[in-house]
């Protein structure tokens, strides 16, 4: 059986939309599947790599690598999207290309970044972990760390940094899929909203879905002990 909830929820474009949340009901009137997984049920994607989930994550990453920051022209906010999802008339798509990106490092101004921009994250404005010396962030936004400390400046002069961010990574469903969504949408979909991150590649949704002890390597499920737990 399925339980369907419909509600008006604030979506990425800043408008309220009618959204359906479909929950598989437990035949035995017990905990939901996500709760059972958290309690240690034998859920194979938490025990070993699942090819289907791995393909999904790789597909999400490939899309994210090509994303940019969609900044609303009316200053209502910004969100990380694909170019096709960013209105050409109502918004500005900030994407580094044709030598418009910042330098990889101040020691080599000539080598420009091509991957980015990312809403609310920039190697030029992040103090911790700083992109410098032996720790220069790669020219691939899907390999960027979470910035834990921004430079103390209320305005950077960068469109993708000075805007109000409207969406962050949200882990939805038992398949560990990730979407950049508003907090409202994420909570309605019973997802896990990552306030600290800017990109889906910075969060490990399956680790969150599985719960219990975190994976030793967040990309490799290793909860073999589930075989004895349930």
């Amino acid at each position: 059986a399925q339980h369907v909830t419909t509600q008006l929820v604030l979506r990425n474009k800043g408008v309220y939309e009618s959204v359906k949340y479909i929950q598989q009901e437990n035949f035995w009137i017990g905990p939901s599947s996500i709760d059972l997984i958290h309690l240690g049920a034998k859920f194979s994607p938490c025990i070993r790599k699942d090819q289907q989930i791995e393909q999904l994550v790789l597909r999400e990453r490939d899309l994210e690598r090509d994303s940019g920051c969609c900044v609303q022209n009316d200053h209502s906010g910004c969100i990380q999207t694909q170019r096709k999802d960013c209105s050409e008339t109502l918004a500005t798509f900030v994407k580094w290309q044709d030598d418009t990106g910042p330098p990889m490092d101040k020691s080599d101004l000539g080598q420009k970044r091509t991957s980015g921009a990312v809403c609310h994250q920039d190697p030029r404005t992040c103090e911790e972990p700083a992109s410098s010396g032996a720790h220069i962030w790669p020219d691939d936004i899907t390999k960027w760390p979470i910035c834990t400390e921004q430079a103390k400046s209320n305005r950077t002069g960068f469109l993708h940094m000075d805007c109000q961010i409207k969406g962050r990574p949200c882990c939805i469903s038992t398949k560990g899929s990730c979407e950049i969504t508003t907090r409202e949408y994420c909570e309605f979909m019973h997802g896990y909203f990552h306030e600290e991150a800017t990109l889906c590649s910075q969060v490990h949704c399956l680790d969150k879905v599985c719960g219990l002890l975190p994976f030793l390597n967040p990309e490799v499920p290793d909860q073999f002990y589930r075989l004895w737990l349930s």
């Epitope: 030598d99 330098p103 101040k106 101004l109 404005t125 103090e127 430079a151 103390k152 002069g157």
Partner: antibody
Framework: QVTLKESGPGILQPSQTLSLTCSFS??????????VGWIRQPSGRGLEWLAH???????YYNPALKSRLTISKDTSKNHVFLKIANVDTADTATYYC????????????WGQGTSVTVSS | DIVLSQSPATLSVTPGDSVSLFCRAS??????LHWYQQESHASPRLLIK???QSISGIPSRFSGSGSGTDFTLSINSVETEDFGMYFC?????????FGAGTKLELK
């Protein structure tokens, strides 16, 4: 507000070492992404970038003059120093210090300049 | 080194005129170009960053455009305080270099 002010000897002789000081206020050179550097302008001519020093003590010099230039800073006193060794009459110019940022590598604040004449 | 060529060397205008100043780079520099104004006996002042981005406190009559090798600084309706020298600067690579300047003078 941000201010920078240069000071120098005014006049010196060829082969001497020119020592310049930039005193600034309104920001700290320990602040991430900020630097202070030197630019000169011979009378009635264009601007020539000389050197920059960054918050993390990284230094960058104009390769054409690198062998003669030394830039340093005293973060606690808000001072940046530039030494030009073995000066020549071609070094006669107005010397400016300016703040730079890694945000765009442009100079957003400039001092008023100090005039330096090299003459025998 | 990247060479910046500015044209014209001198531009004679009357207040109220609209003018365009040009800067050409010896190689493609993306949008890594900034414009400065220097009034007589004063220090330079940043007008435009990244070819077209405005600087806070700079009058809206100043605007920039261009990318790659060709850049333009436009002044819409020149005012008396706009007379002086205008320099472009590239930050595409070290060493940072400036153009020789365009002198905007009263006709």
């Amino acid at each position: 507000q941000v201010t920078l002010k240069e000071s120098g000897p005014g006049i010196l002789q060829p082969s001497q070492t020119l020592s310049l000081t930039c005193s600034f206020s309104g920001f700290s050179l320990s602040t991430f992404a900020l630097g202070v550097g030197w630019i000169r302008q011979p009378s009635g001519r264009g601007l020539e970038w000389l050197a920059h020093i960054w918050w993390d003590d990284d230094k960058y010099y104009n390769p054409a003059l690198k062998s003669r230039l030394t830039i340093s800073k005293d973060t606690s006193k808000n001072h940046v120093f530039l030494k030009i060794a073995n000066v020549d009459t071609a070094d006669t110019a107005t010397y400016y210090c300016a703040r730079i940022t890694t945000y765009y590598y442009g100079m957003d604040y400039w001092g008023q300049g100090t005039s330096v004449t090299v003459s025998s | 080194d990247i060479v910046l060529s500015q044209s014209p060397a001198t531009l004679s205008v009357t207040p109220g005129d609209s003018v365009s100043l040009f800067c050409r780079a010896s190689q493609s520099i993306g949008n890594h170009l900034h414009w400065y104004q220097q009034e007589s006996h004063a220090s330079p002042r940043l007008l435009i960053k990244y070819a077209s981005q405005s600087i806070s406190g700079i009058p809206s009559r100043f605007s920039g455009s261009g990318s790659g090798t060709d850049f333009t600084l436009s002044i819409n309706s020149v005012e008396t305080e706009d007379f002086g020298m205008y320099f472009c600067q590239q930050s595409y690579n070290w060493p940072l270099t400036f153009g020789a300047g365009t002198k905007l003078e009263l006709k």
